[in-house]
Structures are given as structure tokens and as C-alpha cells.
Interface confidence: low
């Protein structure tokens, strides 16, 4: 049999707080437990859910949790079912509501000396007790013509008079807690002696140095007082005014006039009406100074014929909001048609060339007018004035290719050479009119050139072939001074090019003929065996029919090429000793010797006291130091050739002699001993 060890029991619960209905079951077999609320199964939610066999409430809800709960245990095998005792919550709650007019039926019916009943719509369980307030002050029963019925939550004013005017609110409290009215009721019972608004001042916007008028009127019996204040509570009267309101005048009817308004006058003006009885009535109005800022500049616009384009005019900031309109040629644009104004936009539909020109956006308000021009260009496809022509250009001279076009706006011209875009550099220059200049024409400039002229409306192009008229020239020019090795075979080449293949011949500068052992073979001067007499001045002459002849002068020197008689050797020296690096060279002309140490030429005039280069070319270094170690290069050179040889210098510490070593023991290295 199924037995309930713990059964749910009815209990007090607080609205919105936690609660638990306990249920524990003992049975011979497995049972499943579920809950019923008023006979219907309870579905788990985040707020209300099964916790084991018990039912847990995260937040009790007076509407959803009212009713009878029952715990049911069922053996699904045998079908046996047991139900617990019924349990319910006594839910304590309090809920705010508005203060409403119960009697009379509408506010319009409230008259002095009528009965007025207000009801406090705060409800709760247990039933709360009520407290009433007027303008935040508590009201007690039987005081000043009013009755508070705690039971019916009503406040009765009998009869209601002007002194009852005010903001009515209520609060209620019970064992559960306290709540106050969510919406209060303003009772307004006219009193002839209270000031009433007849005319309220309105916000105004005025231009600088113009006048501003605020109207303000109150009525009451006896007549009310009226006072104007500005911003910082400074009173404005006709006798005393702050300096920034010296041009203010208060008229008998309450109107305030400000003349020659300036920035210091801008701000909030308060008109205060005070009756013989009742609170003051404060009305506010703001004086704004009209202002208009400058308009941003327009970028010039380029449009293409046939398209539709829009130009937006951003109105300048201003108060009041500036009005905006577009003009063209001094005429305001219409709001429809092909060229028209739409909102702040200038619209040009199916653009024609004749639409080009200056359009002006105007903006204006009380503070003044601003304008900004936009220049509209209608682009046309370029047309040819002069196409590039096939041209013969002379090598070495400037060459020009025309590409003259016209269009609106001014077209941009680019040039291509062999389909590759020409970028301007020291050799190529594109003039403003589109002409290409080749600063110094070279042979390889002979190719196809194409120019393209473009505007946003389209582009045109044309090409031309350049033929280069080659100049007669040596290729390469012979070296003006050359050396030949004595008693050896030698050749001196000379070649040239031109529009026609030139003939080349050599002759001695003095006009004498070449000796028989010297031959001139197609421009190459050949010496079978160089003699001393072969030295001298020679001329290479290149000539062709159309271009005449050119000459190159060459001075040939006969020399005995340099050889080293003595070369420096790998040398190791003790620190503090002297190193000698020998070097001797021979040749004709007699070679000069230079030394290079540690990758720098040793200048004989700047060697210092430790180094010296002898007449025969040897290098001596006294008092050597470790930093003198390194490779030393002997360089022998004359006007005909140059040779070098190198050797390393090692500087080492002198070893301390050991006891066992006799005075005649040899040093541990091959040394220079000094």
C-alpha cells in the first residue's frame, strides 16, 4: 500500500516570496508523484516546479497559485493511486493603484460647494488600512470638512472649496507591507482670488537687434500681481533692470517688450502671477536669438550628358530652421520639370550640354541669408584637333608626337609605347596640350606609340609609328688612351653605326701610313708584335654617303707590363717589435707602389711616426701592436696597368722563456727579429 509520510498543509504565503508544499511517500514498489491544482495536473515552470516529491514555489503568485493543491502518488505497475489531503495558500499581498474621482462623475462637474469623493485603488489581503495626503501632507478624519472612510477607501470632501485644491495621494499598509498610489489626482477648485492664466507667453525667435514681445496675462479678484524674471531670477521692472536687459519695457497689460535684442538677452523669461490667495503661477517662455551659420563649400561637379544627377545642399545650422532653395542664372528652380528642386536636392534629369553652369543654393532665416555656388560641367567626348602622325625622329635630338583634342572638361591625355603606359620621367614629357616630347631620341624608341584622350563622357585614341634616323656614331667610342704590351700582339677595335653601314679605316694622326706589320682589318687595328715605334696618336675614321665622316683620336702607349720582383710574405712579429713587408715591382713606365692595410689605402703623407714606405716600395711598421694585424696589399701601378699582391701580418705576444729553455732556444714561430 502507498503511505504518505509527509502531507502538504495549508499555510500563509507572501506574494512574490518562496514557498514549499511538502509531500513524502513510502510504497513497496516504485511510484511516481505528481501534483494537482483544483484537480488539474500541475506543469513545471521556472516559477513553480517539483522538487523531489514536494512542490516548490520560487515566487508565489496570488492569481496563479490560488486554489487547492493535492499530491498524488501512483504505482504504474499495479495502477494503485493515493491522494494526499488538500492544501491551499492564504496569500498575503498589496498592490498599488490610482486615486480616482468617484463623485461627481467627471472633473468638469466639480464646482465650489459640491461634494467630492475620491477613491484609493490600492488593494490587498489582508485588507489594508488607508492614509490620505494633500500636497504630501497627511489628512486625518473629521478635519477641515472631509471624511475618511477607511473601510471603503474613500475620501469625501463636503462641501469642496478652493482650500481643498491640491494633489491628492494615498498610501495603504497591511501585515504584508505598504503601497502608495500609482497615479495621483489633482483637484482644482476655482477661487476668484486665485490667479488664473488668461494669456501665456510663447517662445520667440528674433534676429539680432530686432525686438521681441512676450504677452502674459492673469485674472483674479482682486486683480493679481504680475512679475517678470529673467534666467537668473533677476526681476525685470521699468525702474531697475540688469545691464543686458536695459532695453526691456513691461507694459500695463503685462506684456514684456525687448528692443534691440542682442545675445545677452537670450534665455528663459518667467512671468509670475500671484492672486490674493493661492500659489503663484509661473509661466516660462524662451527667447532664442536667430542665427545662421556659413554653408559648406561645394566641390565642382562633372556630369555626363543623358544621365540623371543630384546635388544635395546641406542647409546651414540655424534658428529658426533655414529654408533652402536653388537658383540658376538668377532664377529660382521649379519643383518639377527636367531641372528642378526636390527637397534640398538639385535634380538634373537627362542632362544636356546646355545645363552646364553655376547653380546657387540659398538658405535663409530671420538671421540672414547664406549662399553657395556649385559649378556644374557637362562632360563631352573628346574630338580630334590633330592626331599623332607616323614620324621620322633624329637620334639624339628631341622628338615630338602631337595628340591635340578638345572637350569639356579639358581632356586628360595618356601615351602608350608598345602598349605600355608611358610614365613621365627624364626622357618623356607630356605637355598640357597632350603633345609627347621624347627628350633625346634613342634607337630603341623606334616603335608604335598610342595616345588616348579622355573625359568622364568617353575617350578617343590614335596611334603612330616612330622611325628613328640613326646618327653616325662610334659603337662604342674607342678609349682615347690605350696601352699595348711591348713585344706582344695587340689589337685596337673601332666600330660605328649610321643610317647606312659606314666604312672604317685607321690612320696615324700625323698622316703617315701604317707600317707593314700593322694591319687595318674592317676597323680593327692589328699589331703583330708591338715595337716602341708603334706608340703615338692614331685616328679612326668612320664614314658613309649621307652622313659624312666622324673621327676618333686614340693615343697608344707601348709599355712593359708590371711584374713583381719582390712580393711581401706572410709575416709574424712580436708585439712591440718592427715589421718589414717588402715589395718591389718593375715595368715601363716605372710603376709606383701604394700599400693598402686593413682595407684602406695608406697615405704616405699621413702615416704617422710608426709607419714608413721606402723608396723601393717596402713598408716598415715600428712598435707593432695587435691592431696592426691583418692583410696588407702592395699595389703597383703605372699609366698602363695595375697589379697587386698581398700577405698577412700577425702580431703575437712575446712568450715568457721557461726555466728549461736555454738562452739560445729558437722562437716558436718563423719571426722577423729586430
Amino acid at each position: 500500500a502507498i503511505v504518505f509520510i509527509k502531507q502538504p498543509s495549508s499555510q500563509d504565503a507572501l506574494q512574490g516570496r518562496r514557498a514549499l508544499l511538502r509531500c513524502e511517500v513510502e510504497a513497496p514498489g516504485p511510484v511516481h508523484v505528481y501534483w494537482l491544482l483544483d484537480g488539474a495536473p500541475v506543469q513545471d515552470t521556472e516559477r513553480r516546479f517539483a522538487q523531489g516529491s514536494s512542490l516548490s514555489f520560487a515566487a508565489v503568485d496570488r492569481l496563479q497559485d490560488s486554489g487547492t493543491f493535492q499530491c498524488v502518488a501512483r504505482d504504474d505497475v499495479t495502477g494503485e493511486e493515493a491522494r494526499s489531503a488538500n492544501a491551499s495558500f492564504n496569500i498575503k499581498w498589496i498592490e498599488a493603484g490610482p486615486v480616482v474621482l468617484k463623485h461627481p462623475a467627471s472633473e468638469a462637474e466639480i464646482q465650489p460647494q459640491t461634494q467630492v469623493t475620491l477613491r484609493c485603488h490600492i488593494d490587498g489581503h489582508p485588507r489594508p488600512t488607508y492614509q490620505w495626503f494633500r500636497d504630501g501632507t497627511p489628512l486625518s478624519d473629521g478635519q477641515s470638512n472631509h471624511t475618511v472612510s477607511s473601510k471603503e477607501r474613500n475620501l469625501t470632501l463636503r462641501p469642496a472649496g478652493p482650500e481643498h485644491s491640491g494633489l491628492y495621494s494615498c498610501c495603504a499598509h497591511s501585515a504584508f507591507g505598504q503601497a502608495c498610489s500609482s497615479q495621483n489626482f489633482t483637484l482644482s477648485i476655482a477661487d476668484e482670488s486665485f490667479a488664473r492664466v488668461v494669456l501665456a507667453p510663447q517662445d520667440v525667435v528674433v534676429a539680432r537687434y530686432e525686438e521681441a514681445m512676450f504677452h502674459c496675462q492673469f485674472s483674479a479678484q482682486p486683480p493679481p500681481s504680475l512679475q517678470w524674471l529673467f534666467e537668473d531670477e533677476t526681476p525685470i521692472t521699468n525702474r531697475s533692470r540688469p545691464p543686458h536687459l536695459r532695453r526691456a519695457t513691461v507694459f500695463a497689460n503685462g506684456s514684456l517688450l525687448l528692443t534691440q535684442v542682442r545675445p545677452r538677452n537670450a534665455g528663459i523669461y518667467r512671468c509670475i502671477g500671484q492672486g490674493q490667495r493661492g500659489p503663484p503661477i509661473i509661466l516660462e517662455a524662451t527667447l532664442h536669438l536667430a542665427e545662421i551659420e556659413d554653408m559648406p563649400l561645394f566641390e565642382p561637379r562633372v556630369f555626363t550628358a543623358g544621365s540623371e544627377e543630384r546635388v544635395t545642399c546641406l542647409p546651414p545650422k540655424g534658428l529658426p530652421e533655414p529654408s533652402v532653395w536653388w537658383e540658376h542664372a538668377g532664377v529660382r528652380l521649379p519643383t518639377h520639370g527636367r531641372v528642378y528642386q526636390k527637397g534640398h536636392e538639385l535634380v538634373l534629369a537627362n542632362i544636356a550640354e546646355s545645363d552646364a553652369g553655376v547653380y546657387t543654393c540659398h538658405a535663409a532665416n530671420l538671421a540672414g541669408q547664406r549662399r553657395q555656388d556649385v559649378n556644374i560641367t557637362v562632360a563631352t567626348v573628346p574630338s580630334w584637333l590633330k592626331k599623332p602622325q607616323d614620324s621620322q625622329l633624329e637620334e639624339g635630338k628631341p622628338g615630338y608626337l602631337d595628340c591635340l583634342t578638345q572637350a569639356t572638361p579639358k581632356p586628360t591625355v595618356v601615351w602608350y609605347r608598345n602598349q605600355m603606359l608611358i610614365s613621365e620621367d627624364s626622357r618623356f614629357e607630356v605637355f598640357k596640350n597632350g603633345t609627347l616630347r621624347i627628350n633625346s631620341v634613342e634607337v630603341y624608341d623606334g616603335t608604335w606609340y598610342r595616345c588616348m584622350s579622355s573625359t568622364p563622357a568617353g575617350s578617343i585614341e590614335a596611334q603612330a609609328r616612330v622611325q628613328v634616323l640613326e646618327k653616325l656614331k662610334f659603337t662604342p667610342p674607342p678609349q682615347p688612351q690605350q696601352c699595348m704590351e711591348f713585344d706582344k700582339e695587340a689589337t685596337v677595335p673601332c666600330s660605328a653605326t649610321g643610317r647606312e653601314k659606314p666604312t672604317i679605316k685607321w690612320e696615324r694622326a700625323d698622316g703617315s701610313s701604317l707600317p707593314e706589320w700593322v694591319t687595318d682589318n674592317a676597323g680593327t687595328l692589328h699589331f703583330a708584335r708591338v715595337t716602341r715605334d708603334d706608340a703615338g696618336n692614331y685616328t679612326c675614321i668612320a664614314s658613309n654617303g649621307p652622313q659624312g665622316q666622324i673621327r676618333a683620336h686614340v693615343q697608344l702607349t707601348v709599355a712593359v707590363f708590371i711584374t713583381f720582383k719582390v712580393e711581401p710574405e706572410r709575416t709574424t712579429v712580436y708585439q712591440g717589435h718592427t715589421a718589414l713587408l717588402q715589395c718591389e715591382a718593375q715595368g715601363d713606365p716605372k710603376p709606383l707602389i701604394q700599400w693598402k692595410g686593413k682595407d684602406r689605402i695608406l697615405d704616405p703623407t699621413k702615416l704617422g711616426p710608426r709607419m714608413h714606405i721606402f723608396q723601393n716600395g717596402s713598408l716598415v711598421i715600428h712598435d707593432v701592436a695587435p691592431e696592426d694585424s691583418g692583410r696588407y696589399t702592395c699595389i703597383a701601378g703605372n699609366s698602363c696597368n695595375i697589379k697587386h699582391t698581398e700577405a698577412p701580418l700577425y702580431v703575437v705576444d712575446k712568450p715568457v722563456p721557461e726555466e728549461s729553455e736555454g738562452p739560445g732556444s729558437p722562437p716558436p714561430y718563423k719571426m722577423i727579429q729586430t
Partner: antibody, heavy 118, light 113 residues
């Protein structure tokens, strides 16, 4: 005792910016119009601009309105002058002053010196 | 802008003498609202900030000695020191307090002989 104390001056390079402050005490700062006035070395007084109590109205000398910005923080009783794009001709002693409601500027600070030089 | 012109630019007097300096405005400073002239006079002693002497063209600021008198209306104004004292050595400036921008005159330097 009414006191106005300017600070923030110093050496600034041409084209640079600087923000001057004016600390007020001894009166109800939040209810008064305030002004900045400057005086170049050996020269006369030049009115820079003014600001109303709630910062809704700020006026500048026309020649300076694109360079200078006047502001105030009533909670801190402080008036500010933000200077930008300064040039050598902006070298001067800068004073803050209170507008008297009856007319004129009745209280002045001792001034803070601004030198524009490269 | 209203231009304020002061003359002379400097003057030298002995202690005890009476001195008058002039200030002319390019527009009338008469305030139609209260029939007051919106002009202020300031004194600036060497190394000191300016000090308000006169407002409304003729009203002395509290604490200012009665030897200082402001006069004039419309566009012509004057500041008179009835008996100059050594401590009056200063530059005197007039200011348009009528129309923004509130321009100052170039100043009159008073030297004591």
C-alpha cells in the same frame, strides 16, 4: 571676498593650442555673466568674449570667434578659454572678468601670460 | 563694430590739478529702455589688472573716490579727476557696454609731474 585666478598660460608654438582656466570664489558664480579680455605687451585692452550663466549664450569678438572657445563649469566655479591655431599676435596677458549687472566688469583676475613663439 | 576713440593718448599734470580726458564712440551708447548711457571707465595701474571706476557713463562704482566723475551722453563722454593725486598714475580706458562686441578705447596715460 571676490577672487578670480587665471592659470594655464605659458609658451606655445605657432599653430598650437592652449587652454586657460579662471577659478572663481567669493560670489555666486553660477548666476553671473563672465568675460575674457586680453592685453598685448605695451598695448591696450581687447575684449575676447563672454558667456552667460548656463552657457547657452556665448559671444565672441568677430575676429577671434574661429580661434577661441569660451566655456564654463558651474559645479567647479571655473571659466575656460580654449585657444587654437595661435599666432605671434596672440602673445598677451589674458584676464577673466565678471560682468556687473549694472554695467561694466567689476572684478578682474591678475591675468595669465601667453607667449607664442617657435 | 562700435569704435571707441580716446584723447589725448597721454597727459602730464601736477598733483592737485584738475584733469579731463575724452572718449568718443562711433555710434550712440544711449539705451532707449532706461535712458542710460552704456559706457564704463576703467583705471589700470602699472603691473595691475584694470579696475572699474564708472558705469552707466556717470555712476561711480562703490569705493571709488568722489574726485572721479563721469559725464556725457550719446557719443561724447569724459572722465574728470578734480584734484589729481600721486596714486592716480595709470592708464584710463573707456568701454562700450552697449552693443556687442564690447570694444575698448585705446587708453589715456596719466603721468604725474
Amino acid at each position: 571676498e571676490v577672487k578670480l585666478l587665471e592659470s594655464g598660460g605659458g609658451l606655445v608654438q605657432p599653430g598650437g593650442s592652449l587652454k586657460l582656466s579662471c577659478a572663481a570664489s567669493g560670489f555666486d558664480f553660477s548666476k553671473d555673466w563672465m568675460s575674457w579680455v586680453r592685453q598685448a605687451p605695451g598695448k591696450g585692452l581687447e575684449w575676447i568674449g563672454e558667456i552667460n550663466p548656463d552657457s547657452r549664450t556665448i559671444n565672441y569678438a568677430p575676429s577671434l570667434k574661429d580661434k577661441f572657445i569660451i566655456s564654463r563649469e558651474n559645479a567647479k566655479n571655473t571659466l575656460y578659454l580654449q585657444m587654437s591655431k595661435v599666432r605671434s599676435e596672440d602673445t598677451a596677458l589674458y584676464y577673466c572678468a565678471r560682468w556687473d549687472y549694472d554695467g561694466g566688469m567689476d572684478y578682474w583676475g591678475q591675468g595669465t601670460s601667453v607667449t607664442v613663439s617657435s | 563694430d562700435i569704435v571707441m576713440t580716446q584723447s589725448p593718448s597721454s597727459l602730464s599734470v601736477s598733483a592737485g590739478e584738475k584733469v579731463t580726458m575724452s572718449c568718443k564712440s562711433s555710434q550712440s551708447l544711449l539705451n532707449g529702455g532706461n535712458q542710460q548711457n552704456s559706457l564704463a571707465w576703467y583705471q589700470q595701474k602699472p603691473g595691475q589688472p584694470p579696475k572699474l571706476l564708472i558705469y552707466g557713463a556717470s555712476t561711480r562704482e562703490s569705493g571709488v573716490p568722489d574726485r572721479f566723475t563721469g559725464s556725457g551722453s550719446g557719443t561724447d563722454f569724459a572722465l574728470t579727476i578734480s584734484s589729481v593725486q600721486a596714486e592716480d598714475l595709470a592708464v584710463y580706458y573707456c568701454q562700450n557696454d552697449h552693443t556687442y562686441p564690447y570694444t575698448f578705447g585705446g587708453g589715456t596715460e596719466l603721468e604725474i609731474k
